[in-house]
């Protein structure tokens, strides 16, 4: 009943709780002397389903048969309507529509750890839409049965709060869950298990690693486990890897030797436990232990390259460059590089340790035969030295690669191709492709990049340190014994028209012609490799088309003569620059009047 129902009653048959699809009879009846005051036969009883009228009747009672009620709760209210007055609420009732519980499925129980408590889970099946009580029973030895009830709306988990111990590990226990509501009851199939079946060990803890004599080859992993653990799974991986190495061990007693770890690598280790070979389940993985393995002496050899620069008649500058060893080759933190420079005929040698750089520059005499050796050192030792004889890399013209080209290959890549040298191509031992940003001043501080290519290759894709809209000077060297030949080309991965034209800084007259001088376009405004400059001129105040002179771009050139100007005529001159993508806007304008005699 939903209110005091002083004026009448609402009765529901067969019950306030019905099975989905059932029919109910609802009766609303007035108590004596509770009708309309003057004309009792004027009583109009109205039945509402929620706020919607579904039936009415004149008299002291109303009967209504209701079908098709939905799952859940439906509210029925009976009201009395008298002439010239508002409807008066008489009484009401809630009807609960649901279903009997389905048989609970997939009942399973687990005890987390030897000191944990038994908890069971199951699948309820479809919602009953009614108050449903679940009772979980656990029967075992000594004729004893534990039970616990759950009165939550959605109950699919219960913890008994009791702990099974391994006094009789083979003793059988049987769990069963029963669901009961007003429409029926249903029990799960019984689940029978032993202590060993349901105890899931706690994950191992207190994981440590030891390296005997600071060596990666003598490594032991230690951990602590619950007392009954028989099996362990170990998994480990470098911290930057997604793939695990897995090891299964039996009766490890909290320790295991690992033999295949890489030096100077941070690893993640995890361990899991199990009580029995084929019963029960594995524990969760332990918390991760992260540890770095010790260093070992470097393996591999440095990739070394060099550049020679003429200083004067007696001296030359040698710049050495080398690439870092890979992590797997360095096998530790590289503390320094050792560079040894030796004059081969006289036997003079000097050694220097370089820290923080991968290059070294020195000045040596132009005479003599020179060699260098470079090695990398960590705390455990040094790599094998890379030895190079210093030679004139471009001296042998017949070894120069032919038809060198450089073409853009997608974003920030340049494909360099060439043909083998005229001289016996089989004499080539390797090609080296070298590239550096083009700087008009020939700046030796510009970083040098290189890659090595096998003698049968005639192309190389360069992508390291390649930026869009920058011009690179690319050289291809063919090396054969103590000889080398080279060819060079300019190339860019992406280009567009230069952002500005050259700035004319001076115009001078010489014997009836003029010499124009200009400042180079700043590198960041060239937008790729420049192909040509154009010099434009026209008579001042003239509307005629300007004349022009196109000159090929050369790095060092910044002046050019013009001898087709008329004396005593004032001209306006300006310049542009071109890449393969187009022409720049024009640079500054300069006026000039040639003072020479007229023809």
């Amino acid at each position: 009943k939903i209110d005091a129902c002083k004026r009448g009653d609402v009765t529901v048959k067969p019950s306030h709780v019905i099975l989905l699809g059932s029919t109910v009879n609802i009766t609303c009846s007035l108590k004596p002397r509770q009708g309309c005051f003057h004309y009792s036969r004027r009583n109009k009883l109205i039945l509402y389903k929620f706020d919607r009228r579904i039936n009415f009747h004149h008299g002291h009672s109303l009967n209504s048969q209701v079908t098709g009620l939905p799952l859940g709760t439906t509210l029925f209210v009976c009201k009395l309507a008298c002439i010239n007055s508002d409807e008066i609420q008489i009484c009401g009732a809630e009807i609960f529509v649901g279903v009997a519980p389905e048989q609970p499925q997939n009942l399973s129980c687990i005890q987390k750890g030897e000191q944990g408590t038994v908890a069971c889970t199951w699948e309820r099946g479809r919602d009953t839409h009614l108050y449903t009580e679940y009772t979980l029973q656990l029967s075992g030895p000594k004729n004893l049965t534990w039970q616990k009830q759950c009165k939550d709306i959605y109950c699919d988990y219960l913890d008994f709060g009791i702990n099974l111990t391994p006094e009789s590990p083979e003793s059988n226990f049987t769990a069963k869950v029963t669901a009961v509501n007003s429409l029926g009851s249903s029990s799960s199939l019984p689940s029978t298990f032993t202590f060993l079946d349901i105890v899931r060990p706690l994950p191992p803890w207190d994981i440590r690693i030891k390296f005997q004599k600071a060596s990666v080859s003598r490594c032991t992993l230690y951990w602590r486990d619950e007392g009954l653990v028989l099996l362990n799974r170990l998994r480990y991986r470098p911290s930057n890897s997604r793939l695990w190495n897995m090891v299964n061990v039996t009766k490890a007693k909290g320790r295991h030797d690992l033999l295949d770890l890489k030096p100077f690598t941070e690893y993640e280790f995890q361990i899991s436990s199990k009580l029995h070979l084929y019963k029960g389940s594995w524990s969760d993985w332990s918390e991760s232990l992260r540890a770095q393995t010790p260093e070992e002496e470097p393996t591999g050899m440095l990739d070394v390259w060099y550049m020679k620069r003429h200083i004067d008649y007696s001296r030359q500058q040698i710049s050495l460059f080398w690439k870092n060893l890979s992590v797997s080759e360095a096998r530790g933190k590289i503390l320094h590089y050792q560079v040894t420079l030796q004059e081969l005929t006289g036997g003079k040698a000097m050694t220097q340790n370089i820290t923080g750089h991968t290059s070294w520059t020195t000045v040596i005499p132009r005479t003599g035969n020179w060699a260098v050796a470079v090695s990398a050192a960590n705390s455990k030792g040094s790599s094998l030295p890379t030895r190079i004889n210093i030679m004139n890399l471009c001296e042998a013209g017949l070894l120069a690669p032919r038809q060198v080209s450089a073409n853009s290959e997608g974003m920030d890549n340049i494909l360099v191709t060439w043909q083998p040298p005229r001289k016996d191509p089989s004499a080539v031992q390797e090609y080296v492709v070298e590239w550096r940003e083009l700087h008009p001043g020939g700046d030796t501080q510009v970083p040098l990049n290189w890659l090595r290519s096998r003698p049968y290759n005639v192309s190389a894709l360069i992508s390291e340190n390649i930026k869009s809209y920058i011009c690179y000077e690319i050289r291809v060297y063919a090396l054969s014994g103590d000889q080398g030949g080279c060819s060079s080309i300019l190339g860019n991965s992406k280009h567009k028209a230069p952002l500005s034209g050259p700035h004319i800084n001076a115009i001078t007259e010489e014997k009836g012609s003029i010499l124009i001088s200009w400042n180079s376009i700043p590198v960041q405004e060239q937008m790729g490799c420049l192909l040509h400059y154009r010099i434009y001129w026209k008579e001042r105040d003239s509307n005629s088309q300007p004349q022009l002179c196109e000159i090929p771009y050369r790095v060092s050139q910044n002046s050019h003569p013009i001898n087709s100007l008329q004396p005593r005529v004032t001209y306006v001159l300006w310049m542009t620059a071109l890449t393969a993508a187009g022409e720049s806007s024009h640079g500054n304008e300069r006026e000039f009047c040639l003072q020479g005699k007229a023809n």
């Epitope: 000594k142 913890d159 009791i162 702990n163």
Partner: nanobody, 122 residues
């Protein structure tokens, strides 16, 4: 120290009912499990019923459906409602309390009461 005092025993005819009470003089909030044991002359003490702080209950097969165990933490009391009593239920009934979680299938209590006699006879 926890003191347990049983009451409610007595003589009853077969089919009759009794309600045993066990009052703890200290707080039973720290007690995980409480139980009723019984010992008939010449027999070993056996667990009749137990209840944990979380509300799990246990019954020996011989009393299942006839006896009900409950606890009232506010009154520091545990009850055993015994219905449909049989002559074989005759024994001294002991109250038991265990501070630790139940560490075995059966209850092994830290604390015991002095016992109350239940006799079922016509």
């Amino acid at each position: 120290q926890l003191q347990l005092v049983e009451s409610g025993g007595g003589l009853v005819q077969p089919g009759g009912s009794l309600r045993l009470s066990c009052a703890a003089s200290g707080s039973i909030f720290s007690i995980n499990a409480m139980g009723w044991y019984r010992q008939a002359p010449g027999k070993q003490r056996e667990l009749v019923a137990a209840i944990t702080s979380g509300g799990s209950t246990a019954y020996a097969d011989s009393v299942k459906g006839r006896f009900t165990i409950s606890r009232d933490n506010a009154k520091n009391t545990v009850y055993l409602q015994m219905n449909s009593l049989k002559p074989e239920d005759t024994a001294v009934y002991y109250c038991n309390a265990d501070r630790d979680p139940i560490t075995s299938w059966y209850v092994r209590g830290d604390y015991w009461g002095q016992g109350t006699q239940v006799t079922v006879s016509s």
